[in-house]
């Protein structure tokens, strides 16, 4: 560089007239000449290229061509490069300003609401904050200071579109429409890309997003990009919005969401978007552990430390609201590691969406959309090979968690891929290595990150993980403004609240319940039924007379066995009564002639071997149910396929006597052979493991009738289409609810705080193919089939009408917690 | 098909009272917003104000001093309240459906004369 | 409260011939606008929402554009029946939701 002597281009760059010492100059030509002063390039020439200010710009006389100011007037002129009074007036960096200065709210004026802003960075894995945070200092800031959760669970498939467009509506992809980033209508007989127009047609997008909401509650919405945000949805679009391009540099995008939050009071947004496409394009280049997904990092760190600088710069940085989280993960994929369909058929006559997430339809579309043969293509994909590394679904048999069904847009034919496998058509799909994601949402790769930090959220704080649908009501809630309806549960993330703005309460009952009375302990009907045991009408009327309880023995079992209150009846005019016996209680649906639930808590047994069996070919009718609200024992024998089965195990007896309490038509349900094989291992073992774990669990089981798949119990009517040649429908799925207490000192009765829950949702399916099980005994498939049906109680609550844990002491958000939460038990990234 | 009629009478003294009411016909009242729109002869539109059918309500600031809106479900219909009526209010008073974004469909509109 | 402004107040076009109608706001709208067409003893009659996108039925010689503060309406050859008033009205800022004063397509 040249010699300082030479006089500095300080407060002089691009003056003709200047002449330095030594008659250096500053002018546009010097470098043409060689007589620039020695700052020349630093001053006048990087200046107007960089975002920030540093000790050569501080003062710096007003340049048209830079892409913000360090001049002395430009807090007036409001335009600082962020870190301006950091940089030129020594005050304290937002980064270097310890956590406990931001106590409470501290908005300007005019700022009486505090604005939201919704910052998504494409891509980034949970894993990613933990691994590399010292990379990222800015980010790891926001985590110290704010709130985050140990992730956020994005919403299956673990693609961009869906689960932006999820985040902002707080709708399940199959309710909001953008089921995937690439997808066909049949009704509209078009397809939806990233890369055609046809993605701005309103006809797709479904569902109110948050820009809107706030809209229509007189507030205003400016979106820094986000999927959605450049289509007319109900015929509107946000009051600020700039069309997508990957290529506005992200100094430039927060530099204009800061200009944004300086508008006039009647201009200024209170909600916004800002969108980065990293970290996951480095992630699809090299894959989630590369050195280009580490500079990624370093990139959007920087940038978002800009913004918190920029809102520190405006004394907005306590002010603001701000949620930064991702769409999902990113997991490495392998050449080496692909499913090919030519493998497994002769030709591909079909269309086939290809990757983590694949779908099948038919290749002539529209014509044979409908008549396409998803059954067979199912049939010839399962259990081909035994290191097979997808498993083919019909989407209404997928693990109703996903909710990924009720949508024309969802073909029939999905497979569910292995981690870092990818299922495509044939070997001419070379599009592999690097990174991907779609895949299941409880992989940990692709769990995505959730921070937060403002005047509203708590400080210093970790919260366990919850779902992307969730994050809709709590921006309604930030903005004290009105949801629109949405697949998320109000109120279950009010602990993420200094003072939570919508207080929940337990619904309302429906459906009045009654108790089944004992009128006579001898059946007027025996409903077709046997028990050789049961010799005489004295011995029947013995074992009939346990079922007439008195008011001690009612409240001592309501006690042990419905520790948390029973389950309320939300469905409309459903005619219910409750059973009580000493081991267990049931709500009996009399339309369904079945019960509802049935509740037990099974307590810690010394014992872990398996129960004995149960006294075989024994069944009498319920005398408290009429008989034409009863099944009868003849229906069993009608189907080869069907066989009964019951909600409360008669083996799990305290006395030799009590087996008698279960062994009755008003506890059976009807079952296929086949499910009940698993449902009996379950029971005998597998739920004898977890009382033993837990120190006693509470079970709440019963039947589901989803035969729409649109993941919400069916109307009676629905039921009824799909009764065959008898009396009694055919559940869809089973549910089990197992509670227990966390703390493990404590039995379910007795528990004095949180809950522990293990929810499963499980297809009733005539055979056990999901499992591949020929040959194998209930020991190696039954234990991980069930855990791939695992759920949330708000997912059994949806499919049942019930409601659960009504009598729990515990505030309703803290219920609405443990009823959102979902149990994995993935272990590796 | 969504059909709404507006109901009134056609003269009102000056200093008395507007009102107005729209029967909707062909679906129901429930969610979606319903306004008054009115146009004096020769001229522009203006926008009244709307309710939603729970009952909430926004009106023109410039009227609202003035102006009252109500809903009847169980009616299907919903009703305009303009006190201490001047000759400037005068104009065709229209009912139509609004979902915040535009009005479709409208009633055929109701000739109101404020005479002195 | 926004403003908006239509030109002109009138405008005299043959038939078949082209018309472009003006609407200005007094401060952005981004794309929240929306066109009428009124004929006499008429209520109006939607064209246009979303600044661009044509309501159901409307023939395809009507079309919109613009965005913040500027917006035309285009009719490509006027047709007998398109001679009327047209409006166009904001949604991105309210209450109230406003209108234009109007501009009236008459023959030549």
């Known amino acids: 560089r040249k010699l300082e002597k030479q006089g500095s281009c300080r407060k002089k760059c691009f003056d003709a007239s200047f002449r330095g010492l030594e008659n250096c100059r500053c002018d546009v030509a010097c470098e043409d000449r060689g007589d620039c002063c020695w700052d020349f390039e630093d001053t006048c020439v990087e200046s107007t290229r960089i975002w920030t200010c540093n000790k050569f710009r501080c003062g710096e006389t007003r340049l048209e061509a830079s892409l913000c100011s360090c001049s002395d007037d430009c807090l007036q002129r409001k335009d600082c490069c962020a870190d301006y009074k950091s940089v030129c007036q020594g005050e304290t960096s937002w980064l270097e300003e310890n956590c406990d200065t931001a106590q409470q709210s501290q908005c300007p004026e005019g700022f009486d609401l505090p604005p939201v802003i919704l910052f998504s960075m494409d891509g980034f894995r949970a894993e990613y904050l933990y691994t590399w945070d010292t990379l990222m200092p800015n980010i790891n800031k926001l985590k110290t200071c704010g709130i985050h959760s140990k992730y956020m669970r994005a919403m299956y498939p673990t693609k961009t579109f869906p689960n932006h467009y999820t985040i902002v509506t707080g709708l399940y992809p199959e309710s909001h429409g953008i089921i995937d980033n690439n997808m066909y209508d049949v009704n509209l007989n078009k397809n939806f890309s990233l890369s055609s127009e046809e993605q701005n047609n309103p006809a797709w997008w479904h569902g109110q997003p948050m820009w809107l909401t706030a809209m229509y509650q007189g507030l205003k919405a400016a979106t820094y990009f986000w999927p959605g945000s450049e289509v007319a949805i109900n015929g509107s679009f946000p009051s600020i919005y700039m069309p997508y391009n990957r290529s506005v540099p992200y100094e430039e995008r927060i530099s204009t969401l800061l200009k944004w939050l300086d508008l006039p009071k009647a201009e200024r947004p209170s909600f916004y978007t800002m969108y980065f496409e990293e970290p996951d394009s480095s992630g699809h280049a090299s894959g989630p552990v590369s050195a280009r997904v580490i500079k990624a990092l370093q990139v959007v760190d920087h940038a978002f430390g800009m913004l918190m600088e920029g809102l520190k710069q405006r004394n907005l940085h306590n002010c603001v609201n701000i949620i930064l989280l991702a769409d999902h993960g990113m997991d490495q994929t392998y050449c080496n590691k692909m499913e090919y369909m030519t493998d497994y058929f002769p030709r591909i006559n079909f269309y086939m969406y290809e990757g983590p997430a694949p779908r099948i339809r038919a290749l002539n579309v529209p014509h044979d959309f409908f008549s396409f043969n998803s059954e067979e293509i199912v049939r010839n994909l399962s259990c081909r090979k035994p290191d097979q590394h997808f498993k083919p679904y019909l989407t209404p048999d997928l693990p109703k968690r996903l909710h990924y069904a009720k949508n024309v847009r969802i073909d029939k034919v999905h497979l569910f891929v292995d981690p870092q496998w990818l299922a495509v058509g044939s070997k001419s799909n070379t599009n592999c290595g690097g990174g991907n994601h779609g895949y299941n949402n409880e992989f940990r790769s692709m769990e995505a990150i959730f921070l937060a930090h403002g005047p509203s959220f708590k400080e210093k704080t970790e919260v366990e993980p919850f779902e992307n649908i969730e994050v809709y009501n709590l921006m309604c809630d930030l903005l004290r403004i009105q949801p629109a309806p949405n697949n998320g549960t109000r109120g279950s993330l009010n602990h993420l609240l200094k003072v939570p703005f919508y207080k929940p309460s337990h619904a309302e009952e429906v459906s009045k319940f009654s108790v089944c009375g004992f009128a006579n302990p001898l059946p007027t009907d025996n409903l077709s039924c046997l028990c050789p045991h049961l010799q005489n009408s004295i011995q029947l009327e013995q074992v009939n007379q346990m079922l007439n309880l008195t008011q001690e023995e009612i409240t001592a079992t309501v006690k042990v066995n419905l520790p948390f209150g029973r389950p309320r009846v939300l469905q409309k005019n459903v005619d219910n009564c409750l059973l009580y016996h000493r081991e267990y209680v049931s709500g009996f649906g009399k339309a369904m002639r079945m019960p509802m639930w049935s509740s037990y808590t099974v307590p810690q047994l010394g014992d872990t071997s398996p129960l004995p069996p149960t006294v075989p070919d024994c069944l009498r009718a319920d005398v408290r149910v009429p008989p034409s609200e009863s099944q009868k024992c003849s229906f069993y024998l009608a189907d080869e396929n069907i066989t009964h089965g019951f909600l409360y195990p008669p083996a799990i007896n305290r006395t030799s006597d009590s087996q008698y309490d279960a062994l009755i038509m008003s506890n059976l349900v009807p079952m296929y052979e086949e499910f009940r094989k698993m449902w009996d291992y379950f029971h005998s073992v597998l739920l004898i493991k977890h009382a033993t774990e837990r120190n006693g669990v509470n079970v709440v089981s019963g039947p589901i009738f989803d035969y729409n798949y649109d993941g919400h119990f069916d109307a009676p009517e629905e039921i009824t289409k799909h009764i065959a040649n008898t009396d009694i429908p055919i559940p869809t799925h089973y549910f089990v609810v197992l509670t227990s207490c966390k703390n493990k000192s404590h039995t379910p009765e007795n528990c004095p705080g949180w809950l522990d829950v293990l929810p499963f949702i499980i297809p009733h399916r005539p055979t056990n193919v999901e499992s591949c099980p020929e040959g194998k005994p209930e020991a190696l498939w039954v234990e991980e089939r069930l855990t791939a049906h695992i759920a949330r109680v708000r997912d059994v609550e949806l499919l049942t009408g019930l409601d659960f844990y009504q009598d729990k002491a515990q505030p309703v958000s803290e219920i609405l917690q443990l009823k959102t939460y979902l149990p994995t038990f993935e272990t590796t990234i | 098909q969504v059909q709404l009629q507006e109901s009134g009478p056609g003269l009102v003294k000056t200093s008395e009272t507007l009102s107005l009411t729209c029967t909707v016909s062909?679906?129901?009242?429930?969610?979606?917003?319903w306004s008054w729109i009115r146009q004096p002869p020769g001229k522009g539109l203006e926008w009244i104000g709307n309710i939603f059918y729970s009952g909430s309500t926004n009106y023109n600031p410039s009227l609202k001093s003035r102006v009252t809106m109500s809903v009847d479900t169980s009616k299907n219909h919903f009703s305009l309240k303009l006190i201490s009526v001047t000759t400037a209010d005068t104009a065709i008073y229209y009912c139509?459906?609004?979902?915040?974004?535009?009005?479709?469909?409208w009633g055929q509109g109701t000739l109101v004369t404020v005479s002195s | 409260e926004i403003v908006l402004t239509q030109s002109p107040g009138t405008l005299s076009v043959f038939p078949g011939e082209r018309a472009t109608l003006s609407c200005r706001a007094s401060?952005?709208?981004?794309?929240?606008l929306v066109w009428y067409q009124q004929k006499p003893g008429q209520a109006p009659r939607l064209l246009i929402y979303g600044a661009s996108t044509r309501a159901t039925g409307i023939p395809d010689r009507f079309s919109g554009s613009g965005s913040g503060t500027e917006f035309t309406l285009t009719i490509s050859s006027l047709q007998s029946e398109d001679f009327a008033v047209y409006y166009c009205?904001?949604?991105?800022?309210?209450?109230?939701?406003?209108f234009g004063q109007g501009t009236k397509v008459e023959i030549k």
């Open positions: 401060q952005s709208v981004s794309r929240n």
């Open positions: 139509a459906r609004h979902d915040h974004v535009w009005f479709d469909p």
């Open positions: 009205q904001q949604y991105n800022n309210w209450p109230p939701w406003t």
């Open positions: 062909g679906g129901s009242i429930s969610s979606h917003y």
